[in-house]
């Protein structure tokens, strides 16, 4: 025997109090699948959360975070404080990256500078709290007498023929 509730579409619920007829989900609730015996409560995007998508009778609300905070967890379940570049979030708040580490984003942790010497390269640009070091050619490539990469010939200007 077919369950009469299976005929209830998304956006409704099978109302046991009314002979299992399909009743619309009440305000602030939704059912995303058919055959539901109850509707789920809509999530409220309040305070630090902002509404990205309103709740409808067939789908839950979706939230994001107010400026200065970013989403964490599935479905933006939490909002974490942004820090500045060059900082990381600790239990005591935003703290500057320690020497030798950097963070080029407003979230996440400070990461160690790249160790150029591990790849046999030299440091071309020093690292900062906000930026990783830039590794250059290996020290051997820079020693006197070592063959260097020939720079490309300058492009000829139009209207000039070669001498």
């Amino acid at each position: 025997l077919q369950d009469p509730c299976s005929n209830c579409p998304a956006g409704t619920f099978c109302d046991n109090n009314r002979n299992q007829i399909c009743s619309p989900c009440p305000p602030n609730s939704f059912s995303s699948a058919g055959g539901q015996r109850t509707c789920d409560i809509c999530r409220q995007c309040k305070g630090v959360f902002r509404t990205r998508k309103e709740c409808s009778s067939t789908s839950n609300a979706e939230c994001d975070c107010t400026p200065g905070f970013h989403c964490l967890g599935a479905g933006c379940s939490m909002c974490e404080q942004d820090c500045k570049q060059g900082q990381e979030l600790t239990k005591k708040g935003c703290k500057d990256c320690c020497f030798g580490t950097f963070n080029d984003q407003k979230r996440g942790i400070c990461r160690p500078w790249t160790n150029c010497s591990l790849d046999g390269k030299s440091v071309l640009v020093n690292g900062t709290k906000e930026r990783d070091v830039v590794c250059g050619p290996s020290p051997a490539d820079l020693s006197p007498g070592a063959s260097s990469v020939t720079p490309p010939a300058p492009a000829r200007e139009p209207g000039h023929s070669p001498q």
Epitope: P26, I41, Q44, K46, V48, T66, G68, F69, S77
Partner: antibody
Framework: QVQLQESGPGLVKPSETLSLTCTVS????????WSWIRQPPGKCLEWIGY???????NYNPSLKSRVTISVDTSKNQFSLKLSSVTAADTAVYYC????????????WGQGTTVTVSS | QSVLTQPPSASGTPGQRVTISCSGS????????VNWYQQFPGTAPKLLIY???QRPSGVPDRFSGSKSGTSASLAISGLQSEDEADYYC???????????FGCGTKLTVLG
């Protein structure tokens, strides 16, 4: 299960600053709002303000100029400071945990009575 | 003066059904869900109903909540002497960006 415990002086002099701390035990402070509510003798409940675990705050406009709420996640505590108090600030002060997705206060401290008097 | 309006008192006899009303506006009850709290003398309020009509575990099904437009109500059926308490409605207010409360209804169980 999560429990909240308010602590702080029960007597504060007029014009001074009322300071209370709420200690959260049996659970994490992360992922929730944490509010301060007060109830003057024989009167209504009044929301003072809330702090989200990651530092977002909002205060009742009627008290905003005098209120600061802060959180210390490393100690699982949040605190209330109310400056320039008068006798009208005499009340039972409650701290609460507020669900962040559906906004209801599901855990309350037992309350602490603060009297403002010289 | 509270943002949400409740009658100051209500009463009923054991076994009766009583309802407590809560009236608000479009910025609170009209656009958000309603919660109800129960408070006994000398103790902290306790969550009784959340999201209009949801009962936390441990709350008897004699307690039910509903909402229509900018008003909400709490119904208590099969009234018992231990239901004598203060009942507060509350909800989020979008203009405040925070919660608002009613001033409470003192429920007396007669006889």
């Amino acid at each position: 299960q999560v429990q909240l415990q308010e602590s702080g002086p029960g007597l504060v002099k007029p014009s001074e600053t009322l300071s209370l701390t709420c200690t959260v035990s049996g659970g994490s402070i992360s992922g929730y709002y944490w509010s301060w509510i007060r109830q003057p003798p024989g009167k209504c409940l009044e929301w003072i303000g809330y702090i989200y675990y990651s530092g977002f705050t909002n205060y009742n406009p009627s008290l905003k100029s005098r209120v600061t709420i802060s959180v210390d996640t490393s100690k699982n505590q949040f605190s209330l400071k109310l400056s320039s108090v008068t006798a009208a600030d005499t009340a039972v002060y409650y701290c609460t945990r507020d669900h962040s997705h559906y906004y209801y206060m599901d855990v309350w401290g037992q309350g602490t009575t603060v009297t403002v008097s010289s | 003066q509270s943002v949400l309006t409740q009658p100051p008192s209500a009463s009923g006899t054991p076994g009766q059904r009583v309802t407590i009303s809560c009236s608000g506006s479009s910025s609170n009850i009209g656009s958000n869900t309603v919660n109800w709290y129960q408070q006994f003398p000398g103790t902290a309020p306790k969550l009784l109903i959340y999201s209009n009509n949801q009962r936390p575990s441990g709350v008897p099904d004699r307690f039910s909540g509903s909402k229509s437009g900018t008003s909400a109500s709490l119904a208590i059926s099969g009234l018992q002497s231990e239901d004598e308490a203060d009942y507060y409605c509350a909800g989020w207010d979008d203009s405040l960006n925070g919660p608002v409360f009613g001033c409470g209804t003192k429920l007396t169980v007669l006889g």
